[in-house]
């Protein structure tokens, strides 16, 4: 089975590394723009330039390209908590991040939200915050683990999953309360 | 205590529209980036769009931008979401949520409003 390539993947395929098919006249391969700048216009003819321009500001290629129009620089999202590591340039994307102490959780491939790296207190650090992974806490003795938090074990309701690890607590306190009935 | 009442789903065909709306109460809707996911039958959450307090700035997932539009009134304590050009696979339960603020969790959310996109 032949994998099935696209129009554009079909025709660039035909033409040698960093050259591309001339869209009027499949006999021609041209020069692909640097990065940095975009197709103006197609070479005339064999062996003649390819008329490329540099990105506007605002705008970037990161490769070699035969793009029609340079790609709109991304803004980072500061409802996301998030902020600029480096601007935009005509040939690199702005590069966004979290600030000290965070770490990114990426609730799709290409959105993340910045978020606190857990301190874990009643508890010890089990593996530190990484850039796209909070802070992994052990708790101490007492105390269950909750959405990434150390809880106290009087706050454990029989039903939910910390009744293992505070079992030793429910007890005392169920024996404290039929202690003192009559 | 927080509400957030979705409203405006139900059976469209392909190609249709529907406006969804979700009221806000409980708290102070202005000050509060609001959003949208989705749920679709046997799959998990997906972020469909967000919008920030005062309204100016939106974001959409790539499977429904140029199609869908988020909007909010704060004089009305409501979010929108409007869906044009729908598709089947835009079948699911709709669900507004306040952006969360502590971690990656959704502490207050609706309780969802299905939206059937079928022939």
């Known amino acids: 089975l032949v994998p099935h390539l696209g129009d554009r993947e079909k025709r660039d395929s035909v033409c040698p590394q960093g050259k591309y098919i001339h869209p009027q006249n499949n006999s021609i391969c041209c020069t692909k723009c640097h990065k940095g700048t975009y197709l103006y216009n197609d070479c005339p003819g064999p062996g003649q330039d390819t008329d490329c321009r540099e990105c506007e500001s605002g705008s970037f290629t990161a490769s070699e390209n035969h793009l029609r129009h340079c790609l709109s620089c991304s803004k980072c999202r500061k409802e996301m908590g998030q902020v600029e590591i480096s601007s935009c340039t005509v040939d690199r994307d702005t590069v966004c991040g979290c600030r000290k102490n965070q770490y990114r959780h990426y609730w799709s491939e290409n959105l993340f939200q910045c978020f606190n790296c857990s301190l874990c207190l009643n508890g010890t650090v089990h593996l530190s915050c990484q850039e796209k992974q909070n802070t992994v806490c052990t708790c101490h003795a007492g105390f269950f683990l909750r959405e990434n938090e150390c809880v106290s074990c009087s706050n454990c309701k029989k039903s939910l999953e910390c009744t293992k690890l505070c079992l030793p607590q429910i007890e005392n306190v169920k024996g404290t309360e039929d202690s003192g009935t009559t | 205590e927080v509400q957030l009442l979705e409203s405006g789903g139900g059976l469209v065909q392909p190609g249709g529209s529907l406006r969804l709306s979700c009221a806000a109460s409980?708290?102070?809707?202005?000050?509060?980036?609001m959003v949208w996911v989705r749920q679709a039958p046997g799959k998990g959450l997906e972020w469909v769009s967000h919008?920030?307090?005062?309204?100016?700035?939106?974001y959409y997932a790539d499977s429904v931008k140029g199609r869908f539009t988020i909007s909010r009134d704060n004089s009305k304590n409501t979010l929108y979401l409007q869906m044009n050009s729908l598709r089947a696979e835009d079948t699911a339960v709709y669900y507004c949520a306040i952006l969360p603020k502590r971690g990656p969790r959704f502490d207050y959310w609706g309780q969802g409003t299905l939206v059937t996109v079928s022939s």
């Open positions: 409980g708290f102070t809707f202005a000050h509060e980036p």
């Open positions: 919008i920030d307090r005062v309204g100016q700035d939106a």
